[in-house]
Amino acid sequence: CKAMHVAQPAVVLASSRGIASFVCEYASPGKATEVRVTVLRQADSQVTEVCAATYMMGNELTFLDDSICTGTSSGNQVNLTIQGLRAMDTGLYICKVELMYPPPYYLGIGNGTQIYVIDPEPCPDSDF
């Protein structure tokens, strides 16, 4: 297993609709054809897997149908979008990239993007 540098923004504020997008960029040392991207969430010292996708270079990322993540790839960049976020989902979202094929296997883990989520203010009741 060889180490690889992964860069991602430090802080991002999700939209009022609970959507957060950020780029995860990895310094690929070779010509990988198969890449796996995993998003981990760290909050209160616990780390959980948010979503993961394996893709072939040049193809779209395919997450599971019920995943809250979508993404696109371009060269050594992966543009990740996480939706359905609420204030309680605020936390550090870490991008993990694995170059699966061809060997050697490379692993890179970013420093994380602190995603802040603000629940929208409830609309005041109005009489019609």
Epitope: V11, L13, S15, S16, Y116
Partner: antibody, heavy 117, light 108 residues
């Protein structure tokens, strides 16, 4: 090295608007947020809100909602805070601060805004 | 909104003494995202501690932070003349990011 340099002192009349700038250097501007914090004479620190330089999304304290606008110009790595309908109790030093994973790790030198008729 | 309460309001000590400052939150601070800042007259605040216990870059090791949940402490092991200032805690785990009212450490 990381630096945040703010615009100079302003004197405004009640009801007017003020726009304070905060020019960042020494880091990737879009990777962080910019918060605005104010301090009235002899008082403590009051957080006003922040803007995500990555996507331009903003989060304002309810007290300032509708009266404040925070923006960024990524081409010049500059953040702006505009406060409208100024009152005498808005007289304060306004600070910008970089929001990172470690909280507000770098601060501007402050801009004194005086509201007086 | 998380309300932060700092105590004491003023701490009168001599150089070389130990200072213990308290910050209490009205509810648990998410991921212990609690920071401590030092501010001297006419200057911008300076980050001392983040994540409740991590020292910021360039901060001397006489400054230490501890605590979790709702109770946090800043300790200055041996006060130096340049440490006499106002100290603020701030939570940045959930919006709005609130500050405590501050503790003034002055010379006895």
């Amino acid at each position: 090295q990381v630096q945040l340099v703010q615009s100079g002192a302003e004197v405004k009349k009640p009801g007017a608007s003020v726009k304070v700038s905060c020019k960042a250097s020494g880091y990737t501007f879009t990777s962080y947020g910019i918060s605005w914090v104010r301090q009235a004479p002899g008082q403590g620190l009051e957080w006003m809100g922040w803007i995500s330089a990555y996507n331009g999304n903003t989060n304002y304290v309810q007290k300032f909602q509708g009266r404040v606008t925070m923006t960024t110009d990524t081409s010049t790595s500059t953040a702006y805070m505009e406060l409208r309908s100024l009152r005498s109790d808005d007289t304060a030093v306004y600070f910008c601060a970089r929001l990172s994973r470690a909280g507000h790790d770098y601060w501007g030198q402050g801009t004194l805004v005086t509201v007086s008729s | 909104e998380i309300v932060l309460t700092q105590s004491p309001g003023t701490l009168s000590l001599s150089p070389g003494e130990r200072a213990t400052l308290s910050c209490r939150a009205s509810q648990s601070v998410s991921s212990n995202y609690l920071a401590w800042y030092q501010q001297k007259p006419g200057q911008a605040p300076r980050l001392l501690i983040y994540g409740a216990s991590s020292r910021a870059t360039g901060i001397p090791d006489r400054f230490s932070g501890s605590g979790s949940g709702t109770d946090f402490t800043l300790t200055i092991s041996r006060l130096e003349p340049e440490d006499f200032a106002v100290y603020y805690c701030q939570q940045y785990g959930s919006s709005p990011f609130t500050f405590g009212p501050g503790t003034k450490v002055d010379i006895k």
